[in-house]
Structures are given as C-alpha cells and as structure tokens.
C-alpha cells in the first residue's frame, strides 16, 4: 500500500464566473475523522479556515463558503461565492487537511489552473486526472492506451526498485522536501505540464483534536518517505501550482480516555505550540 495522499482541485463554474468549487479527496486506507478547508495557505500557517467537516457531527462553514458537503466517504466539495468583481479566488491557494486514522494528518493545497476555461475542468476522480489544453490531440482510446502502458511501465520499474523504508527522525522540527514523480517528457505535453512536490514536515503533535476511540497523538519520530505514483495506481496528478504537504502524525493508543471527552475528535499534528487538548476534541 502506498503513502496516503490528498488531492485538491479548484474549478470555476461555467454558469457563474463568480462561483468556484474546491474539491478535495483522500487517497488512503484510513478512516477520515475530520477535514479542514482553508484559503491563503495551510491551516495554522497563515491560512484562514473556510469549512470544517466531520463525517458524523456535521459541517461548519464561513463566508465566502456557500456550501460544504461530503461527496463520498473520502472526498468533499466546497462551493464558494465570490462577491467581488475582480474574482480574488482565481489567484488564491486553497488547502485541504484530512485527519485520518491511523495515518495522521495530511494536507494538500492547490489553486485554479492559470489557463483553465470555466467548466472545462474534469470532476475529481480517484484515477489520474489527464488535463490537456489541446483535448482534441489525444482521443479517448489514445489516452487509455497511453495510461495503461505508462502504468505498466511504472509497475515494472517499481518491481526492480528497493522498497522505501521508514526513516527515523529524531528532530521534531525537521522538514524534508523532495521532488515527486516528474512525468516523462512525452507525458508532460499531454498532461498540462503538471508537477507535485511532497513536503513532509514533522511537528510536535498537539491534541487539537483526538480520535473518537480515544487514540492520542504523540510527537512524530518516523516519517513516510515520499513515493511516486507507481506506489498507487489511483494517484491523481495535481494541477500546476499545487503541492502536497504531508504532515505525518503517528498515533498511539492512550490507555484510558480522559475524564471529559468529545465526539470523534481528530488529532492534528500541529506546530503552533504546546497547548494540548486533553479530550478527543475535534473540529466542528
């Protein structure tokens, strides 16, 4: 099983140019306990919360968010109403943070592709998204053949590559940035020149939120090494300007629940300070 990933896609609505929708999804085996959508940067690092979605408690959203909803068990959408005439959303970064069990907290950011035509963005799917400016160049069959061939090639290459191991890290503040899966030259033209950067940051974990089953988060002492798309055939290629920031929080089971606990709260590894939440406090 590959490293969990988060994808983000920003779409401008074809009918109303002032309306935008942010789609986010989590690609991983764990169960999602909380999703936070922010704009202007990652949550807790200069970003402003737009919505918080709990899989059972409900959603909370704030202007300019119009409607936040779960699209599937592992993906959400957030409709935004742009009241301004100059459409500030077009140049804004939107970030989605998924707190999941047992993987921890994973965040990804993205913005509207610079050359995007309203309504042309394909809806997010759990398979690689092929974004071509010249859509007519590649027929559907060509795309499928190319995709299958490329996947087979990657899988064959993966067989001969040593498996990445967990790298122990003894510094909580350590950050590791690596270029991930640069697409081949042939595919770059067809794939709208996409790229993605995996940014793995290790933070002292604070119990901003805790798991419904009373699991607690400890400071991370190990991190997943980034893997390319060969690790998972269902990795979408992120639109240009996106990056994947992986905050890897390892969970350990707390012996007993705290005296006062809240519903299904999620643990977010967090670099904002030592204040810890003693309950399973989550986001609303």
């Amino acid at each position: 099983a590959g490293t969990p990933e988060v994808w983000v896609q920003v779409q401008m609505e074809a009918t109303e140019l002032s309306s935008f929708t942010v789609h986010c999804g989590f690609l991983g085996p764990g169960s999602i306990s909380l999703v936070t959508v922010s704009w202007g940067g990652p949550d807790g690092a200069g970003g402003t919360k737009l919505a918080v979605l709990h899989p059972e408690l409900g959603t909370r959203q704030w202007a300019p968010a119009r409607q936040a909803r779960w699209e599937t068990q592992s993906s959400i959408s957030l409709a935004l109403e742009d009241s301004g005439a100059s459409s500030p959303f077009a140049n804004t970064t939107f970030c989605c943070k998924f707190a999941s069990f047992p993987e921890g907290s994973w965040e990804s950011c993205g913005s509207l592709p610079p050359s995007s035509d309203p309504g042309l963005s394909a809806p997010p799917t759990p398979v690689p998204i092929l974004r071509a400016d010249l859509a007519g160049i590649l027929g559907l069959s060509g795309v499928l053949l190319f995709g299958c061939g490329y996947l087979l090639h990657l899988l064959r290459r993966q067989k001969h590559r040593p498996t990445p191991r967990l790298q122990p890290s003894h510094t909580n503040s350590q950050a590791l940035t690596a270029q991930a899966w640069a697409p081949s030259q042939a595919s770059q033209a067809a794939l709208h020149d996409p790229y993605a950067t995996i940014n793995t940051s290790f933070c002292p974990a604070t119990l901003d939120t805790a798991h419904p089953n009373g699991w607690a988060s400890l400071p991370t002492h190990a991190a997943h090494q980034p893997q390319g798309p060969a690790a998972s055939a269902s990795t979408p290629i992120l639109a240009r300007g996106s990056f994947v920031s992986v905050e890897n929080g390892l969970y350990t089971q707390a012996g007993e629940r705290p005296p006062h606990t809240g519903p299904g709260l999620t643990l977010f590894p967090d670099c904002r300070g030592p204040r810890a939440l003693e309950g399973r406090f989550g986001v609303r």
Partner: antibody, heavy 114, light 113 residues
C-alpha cells in the same frame, strides 16, 4: 479537560444591551467555533449563531441578525456575545458551546425586566 | 430552516422498561455522498446544560451508557433507552446537524411512572 466557563447572571432593562463572556480552556481556542444557544424558561433550545476565533468569521441565525454581535479574544481564549435592544422575551439562559455542541458552558441567566 | 418535531411531548415509563422518543425532520438529514445522517440527541437535566448523547443518528458519544441507542434515516429518527434508570429522568432533544441553522426539536420530557 475541555472547559467553557461563562460570566454570571445579569438583570437588564428593556432597550439596553448585555454582553456575556465564555472562557475556553483545554484546547486550542482558534481551532473550533464557539456556538451560542439560548433557552427561555421552560422552553427549548434556540441557536443564536457562532464565531470562529482567529479569523472572527461568524454565522448568525437570521432571527438575531442586527441585534447580536460575536467577538473573540484569542489572547484570553474568551468569546463574547452582545445582544442589544433587549426585550422581555430575551429573558433566557444563554449557553456557549463548542465542537458541534459536545462541550457546553454552565449557562448565563439574562433577565430583562423593567 | 429545517423543522424538527418530537413525539411525544412527555413520556412516563417504569424503571427497567423501554423508553422510545421519536423525532421527525421537515427535510432529509441524510447526506447522499457519504450516506451519513446528520442528527444528534441531547439529554438535559434541570439546571444543567444539554449533554450530547448520540451523533450521526446512531453513534453513541463516549461515556454514554449502552442502554441509549439511536436509529433511523432520512426524516424519521428514534432514541431508545432499553432499560430506564432513575438518572435518565430528563428532557431529551433531537437536533438537525445537516444544514444551517442548527435547529432543535421542542423536547420530550421523560419521567418515571
């Protein structure tokens, strides 16, 4: 332990304003909304609105728009609800709550009487 | 706004017997995307704030005794106390957690017969 501690009971004249405080502890204050709910004597629960500390983003129940103001002070982890143009029917216990109504303050009784 | 209607308004049940409270919403509380029902149940004792018992229509909050259970989907929901205890005497509220504004039922007063 997550705690929400509210200010004490208030007696107000019709037409005046009241400001109720709610001090949060045990979690990162800016992470979650503070909700405000009221309960008139012998009646049910009525949502007034919410504020997200940090960004100070708010949502209001239409019924209270224009009469209620939410503020939050991150330095003291305290949220405030101010209700103006008070009338006798605003007599109620006012609660602050957080995290999808999982945590509640003890309530503040506001009595509006001439 | 979604209107939440509870029945009955009051209920008297003998100790050890089953108590059932119903809640009906004016719109569906089911999110088709993740197939979750956004309904919560609260218990309120005199002089105290409400206490969350059940969320997601059927998920019991941590620390809530397993005699409390929630069921239902869409617009019709039920809170069941399988064996009534003296400490369960309270007013129970259902709440729409599906969409703004959050709305509560009028409450059901549960007493011992």
């Amino acid at each position: 332990e997550v705690q929400l501690v509210q200010s004490g009971a208030e007696v107000k004249k019709p037409g005046s304003s009241v400001k109720v405080s709610c001090k949060a502890s045990g979690y990162t204050f800016s992470s979650f909304s503070i909700e405000w709910v009221r309960q008139a004597p012998g009646q049910g629960l009525e949502w007034i609105g919410e504020i997200l500390p940090g960004s100070n983003s708010t949502n209001y129940n239409e019924k209270f728009k224009g009469r209620v103001t939410f503020t939050a002070d991150e330095s003291t982890s305290t949220a405030y609800m101010e209700l103006s143009s008070l009338r006798s029917e605003d007599t109620a216990v006012y609660y602050c709550s957080s995290y999808w109504f999982a945590y509640w303050g003890q309530g503040t009784l506001v009595t509006v009487s001439s | 706004d979604i209107v939440m209607t509870q029945s009955p308004d009051s209920l008297a049940v003998s100790l050890g017997e089953r108590a059932t409270i119903n809640c009906k919403s004016s719109q569906s509380l089911l999110n088709s995307g993740n197939q979750k029902n956004y309904l919560a149940w609260y218990q309120q004792k005199p002089g105290q704030p409400p206490k969350l018992l059940i969320y997601g229509a059927s998920t019991r909050e941590s620390g809530v005794p397993d005699r409390f259970s929630g069921s239902g989907s869409g617009t019709d929901f039920t809170l069941t106390i399988s064996s009534l205890q003296a400490e369960d005497v309270a007013v129970y509220y259902c709440q729409n957690a599906h969409s703004y504004p959050p709305t509560f039922g009028q409450g059901t007063k549960l007493e011992i017969k």
